[in-house]
């Protein structure tokens, strides 16, 4: 009887495949007159279409690379695998979908890089005192979680330009605390102090050398610092095969993109590294603060987990920002930073207790739906994250990829990766819109009224000015 | 296409001057139209960036523009035991410009000021200042409502209340139909932000060169607040005027505060006594809701409507990913004393980091359909992020949600095409309102002229057989 394939009045194999994933096309010349060429496969076989003349591409998912998941992160870290498989090929015919799955494991003893980015405006004076032995304490605590820790240090205040900076009397430029009859450092935007190192005592030594500065207004320029600490990977020393924690500590609000105009700065942040040989952010006074969107993009690109370690008075603000910057955690910092050690350990635990998939470069014509199998083998539909995990747990996700119509570009690829992980699954997609029989097309065919058309897939495709089944 | 995208007129300013940062149409007393252009990084007489203002007479072929002359030298005056000082290097003259009647107001929001007394000082801070010019008569005046002679120690003792030292007056500016200059000063009251208002006529009459600190008796300033929602809110980042209380004898002020309430952003409508009539809150933190504001009647009901730009708004896309595209909110003014409610229409940008909504300009009735139209800029949108201006037509429901025309930047990437926009004035005298677009990164301004609209009417005659 009639069905979706036969009622659409299609006149070519390509059109037929686009009607529905259930439709097949018969290119057999011997197909009885009146039998539809576009029909369900079983109907075409019933109509005695030769099986080899039936065009019925089937969507498929093929694993191309599948290294097994690692148990431990120690040893040769470049061989550590946390996502499996690593590469698959999808073939999708128009409007069809295909399922594939991905497994993720939070491996034990994975290397960790922690970069401590500290607000050194005047109110952080007591905090600087509190963290002067943080390096060794952090190493002791983190040793329970990783045998391969590196820590680094950077500091920020704000853009050293009026009105954020005190510019009079002249003495205030070198000592912004001049009017308080005390001494503090000249204002700076962001300075990188200690490249990530496993010599944890160096952290203590460098922190002890630091001194606070002072700026005029309440918000600080920490987002400039986050951006630079994120994109200056060589300066900071972020390792490819490590968890990256960027610990941002402050007791104040932050400046955001478009605030810079109050200092006459309108050039948008370019998201590039501008930390020179002097380890200072050189574009501080020429480039605006970065937007949340740009920060998110760069943090994600560099697989950095941002931790907002902020005091009670601004915790709601940063909580709100964290909801707009996926993969960010927020912890409440005590007024003198004395609890920062526990805060980092807790935040790291929170990060490692969650696996959330992100998709990059998804073609517009594709849509994905996720089902998660987290703990107890329970399948949770519509979820692409798992919470409450322990280090060493493995989770899996079943993903359905559905294509809308037939994209122009026949081959595309996209990436699925857990947020904050280096590992990813690359999905190469081929959109199977064409029929194999098109390759045997006969241009100017005698079957089409002495060359008035191309004979293709069992039918005539007429040239300009000609109509009819034989272009007659 | 109402705006001709081919027959453009270009005006260029000095390299690196940021010519096009701000602009406005200027009509002289004979009705001749010119374009005032701000170039806040123009080099002054001592080769310091003082900024500058250019007056471009209308010529279809465009070209260079003469600059308006203002006193760009630092000034010092001794009054009793005090020394008053102005500092004009990097003052940003031309960061905002506005024309009214035959007067041009050009502001330098980063002009610094200090007062010295013995070993004490007020502190060198950006109070901001506006220069007024009547080009035909050569008259000049200055208005700097945030200058004062209070010393730093006094502010400390008073917990920094009523502290106008960082005002940046003239960061935004507008003149009411009645000739009152309204300045936005987002750094006023220790970065809460303030508004200053004074009649242009009184500014001229009270001005004496070299006095540096004087009083415009008819001026009024908004108030300080101890409400933390206003702290660092940059109230006055943008400003517009309109009619929002049903009383045609009064003018209301529209003020953008893009970082109000911990960066949520807000726009407030106030009466001329600075009493709040309405507050519109931002939708998303850090989206910079209130970066731009515009007032025009888009739905033809005779009441002013309000448009607000949030150029950093992030839209939730596939896979719940946020994409920073920018958004414009249309608030239609309801009948009667009702508050402006939820936005009637959301226009959302399409290009990542395009900053759609950075500038909004009323265009007048571009297509002669009885409804006013608007232009919205995405200075980093369009092909290769070169900038784009989109035209949206008015209709009885408000605005059409799809642009009727998209103007791609004729300048290279980084020119910030659309950073400043002005419309609703007919520059070429063809009866249709034109649009001027600033591209400070290219140091250029483009003039888009509206073309006559062809109205076709079809008649079908059916003959009896």
């Amino acid at each position: 009887g009639p069905n979706i394939c036969t009622t659409r009045g299609v006149s070519s194999c390509q059109q037929c495949l686009a009607v529905s994933p259930m439709c097949a096309w018969c290119s057999d010349e011997a197909l009885p007159l009146g039998s539809p060429r576009c029909d369900l496969k079983e109907n075409l076989l019933k109509d005695n279409c030769a099986p080899e003349s039936i065009e019925f591409p089937v969507s498929e998912a093929r694993v191309l690379e599948d290294r097994p998941l690692s148990d431990k992160g120690s040893g040769d870290s470049s061989q550590v695998t946390q996502v499996s498989p690593q590469r698959i090929a999808l073939r999708l015919r128009p409007d069809d979908s295909k399922n594939f799955s991905i497994q993720v494991r939070q491996v034990e003893d994975y290397p960790v890089d922690i970069y401590y980015l500290m607000d050194l405006s005047y109110s952080m004076k007591d905090d600087l005192w509190s963290i002067q032995n943080l390096g060794t304490k952090l190493a002791t605590q983190m040793r329970k979680l990783t045998s391969n820790l590196r820590i680094g240090f950077g500091a920020f205040v704000d853009k050293p330009v009026s009105p954020y900076m005190y510019i009079s009397p002249p003495e205030a430029l070198e000592n912004p605390c001049y009017d308080m009859k005390t001494t503090c450092l000249p204002m700076f935007g962001y300075k990188h102090v200690l490249t990530l190192t496993d010599q944890v005592t160096r952290f203590n030594e460098e922190v002890k050398k630091q001194s606070v500065s002072r700026n005029r207004d309440a918000p600080e320029g920490g987002f400039d610092a986050i951006m630079q600490a994120t994109v200056c990977d060589e300066k900071i020393g972020w390792r490819n095969d490590a968890s990256h924690l960027l610990v941002f500590t402050t007791d104040a609000k932050t400046h955001i993109a478009l605030d810079g105009r109050l200092a006459g700065i309108v050039q948008p942040n370019d998201g590039q590294c501008h930390v020179g040989s002097d380890n200072h952010y050189s574009a501080s006074t020429t480039m605006d603060y970065p937007s949340l969107g740009l920060m998110t993009e760069k943090l994600s690109q560099k697989n950095i987990n941002l931790i907002f370690a902020v005091t009670e008075n601004v915790v709601n603000l940063y909580q709100n920002y964290s909801e707009l910057i996926p993969g960010t955690t927020v912890g409440v910092l005590s007024m003198d930073s004395s609890n920062v050690l526990q805060l980092i350990v807790d935040a790291y635990g929170k990060i490692r207790s969650k696996v959330e998939l992100e998709v990059r470069d998804l073609p517009e014509e594709l849509s994905l739906s996720f089902n998660a199998t987290c703990l107890n083998n329970e399948v949770i539909p519509g979820l692409k994250s798992c919470m409450g995990l322990k280090i060493g747990d493995t989770v899996s996700f079943s993903i359905e990829a559905k294509v809308r119509g037939c994209p122009q570009e026949k081959e595309k690829s996209f990436t699925i990766k857990p947020v904050g992980f280096k590992d990813s699954l690359i999905v190469q997609v081929t959109f199977d819109c064409d029929c194999a029989c098109q390759a045997q097309a006969e241009p100017n065919s005698h079957r089409c009224n002495n060359g008035n058309g191309t004979f293709e897939c069992g039918v005539c495709r007429c040239g300009p000015g000609w109509l009819g089944s034989q272009c007659e | 296409l109402n705006l001709d995208p081919v027959q453009l007129t270009f005006y260029a300013g000095p390299n690196g001057s940021q010519f096009g940062f701000s602009l406005d149409f200027h009509k002289d007393s004979h009705g001749r139209v010119a374009i005032v252009v701000g170039a806040p990084r123009t080099l002054g007489p001592s080769q310091e960036e003082t900024g500058g203002v250019f007056l471009c007479p209308w010529r279809a072929e465009g070209g260079q523009c003469p600059s308006l002359l203002f006193d760009l030298r630092d000034e010092t005056r001794n009054v009793g035991s005090q020394t008053l000082q102005t500092f004009k290097a990097r003052q940003g003259l031309g960061a905002s410009v506005v024309s009214w009647s035959d007067v041009i107001v050009a502001c330098a929001p980063w002009q610094h000021w200090n007062v010295l007394e013995k070993t004490e000082e007020a502190e060198k801070t950006p109070v901001g200042s506006c220069f007024l010019a009547q080009p035909e008569s050569g008259r000049r005046a200055e208005y700097s409502p945030c200058r004062g002679n209070t010393l730093s120690r006094i502010y400390v003792e008073n917990d920094f209340s009523w502290d106008k030292r960082y005002c940046e007056a003239g960061f935004s500016s507008v003149v009411t139909q009645a000739g009152e200059l309204v300045l936005g000063a987002p750094g006023g009251y220790y970065f809460l932000g303030l508004l200053a208002q004074a009649p242009v006529a009184d500014i001229f009459s009270s001005y004496r060169p070299g006095i540096l600190l004087w009083h415009v008796s008819s001026q009024s300033l908004s108030f300080d607040s101890s409400n933390p929602e206003y702290f660092d809110g940059y109230w006055g980042y943008s400003v517009a005027v309109g009619e929002f209380d049903g009383d045609l004898n009064t003018t209301e002020y529209v003020v953008g505060a893009p970082t109000w309430s911990w960066t949520l952003g807000a726009v407030e409508i106030l009466d001329s006594y600075y009493q709040r009539l309405h507050r519109l809150r931002g939708e998303q933190m850090a989206s910079y809701f209130g970066h731009s504001v515009a007032v025009t009647d888009v739905n033809g009901d005779g009441r002013h409507d309000l448009l607000v730009g949030a150029p950093l708004y992030m839209e939730s896309r596939a896979d719940r990913k946020l994409a920073e595209v920018g958004r414009v909110y249309l608030f239609l003014q309801p009948r009667g004393p009702h508050a402006l409610g939820a936005p009637s229409l959301l226009l959302t940008g399409t290009q990542l980091y395009g900053r759609f909504g950075s500038a909004i300009a009323p265009l007048g009735d571009l297509d002669r359909d009885g409804y006013n139209d608007i232009a919205v800029a995405a200075p980093y949108g369009g092909p290769s992020g070169r900038g784009q201006v989109l035209v949206f037509l008015g209709q009885s429901e408000g605005l059409r949600s799809r642009p009727s025309q998209v103007l791609d930047s004729p300048f290279p990437t980084g020119s910030a095409f659309g950073f400043s926009l002005r419309g609703a004035v007919d520059i070429d005298d063809n009866g249709y309102p034109d649009l001027i677009v600033g591209a400070y990164g290219a140091n250029q301004v483009a003039v888009y002229r509206a073309q006559p609209v062809v109205k076709a009417s079809v008649q079908l005659l059916v003959q009896d057989s």
């Epitope: 600087l128 009859k181 | 070993t119 120690r153």
Partner: antibody
Framework: QVTLKASGPGIVQPSQTLSLTCSFS??????????VGWIRQPSGKGLEWLAH???????RYNPALKSRLTISKDTSNNQIFLKIASVDTADTATYYC?????????????WGQGTTLTVSS | DVQITQSPSYLAASPGETITINCRAS??????LAWYQEKPGTTYKLLIY???TLQSGIPSRFSGSGSGTDFTLTISSLEPEDFAMYYC?????????FGGGTKLEIK
Amino acid sequence: QVTLKASGPGIVQPSQTLSLTCSFSGFSLNTSGMGVGWIRQPSGKGLEWLAHIWWDDDKRYNPALKSRLTISKDTSNNQIFLKIASVDTADTATYYCARSHYYGTFYFDYWGQGTTLTVSS
Amino acid sequence: DVQITQSPSYLAASPGETITINCRASKSISKYLAWYQEKPGTTYKLLIYSGSTLQSGIPSRFSGSGSGTDFTLTISSLEPEDFAMYYCQQHIEYPWTFGGGTKLEIK
């Protein structure tokens, strides 16, 4: 050349208020960045900073003694003064005045001759 | 308050020798430490400020080093007039505090 000299009563009875004077020359407290302060040293013990007065009349005190100290200046006569209320035997010490002239930071660059004070009934 | 611990409290050396005196702060004071010399019959004299900056008029045999919490005053090839009391003082925050002093005597 810069000189400072501290002077005081020599002996004072417990619970009384002690007044000390520092006379200086070679500089003026009208100069931005200039300050003069008091330091004391009980016999055989270390130095203890007490108070400081600055060019703009800003005053700083050691919190441990703040409630008992008052510092003031007479700029025209190049003098500063320190009053210590309710003295007791623990205040027996040599009292010095010293100058601070801002040069990137604040420190004592010139010291005066001390004045010895004994608290005794 | 920042506590300053100075060591040793007593030091005996001979002219021509090089000696070091140490000061340790209870918390980081960046570079802001000054050194003073006290000799009987004269006023206190500033030698070094900001950790390592030599006050004008002071001989170059005096030098200061250190930052954070640990600082050192070094006197190379001692002269007879160098035998005196030495004090360090932090000058970064109020209340300004001093070390307990080091008595340098001739051996």
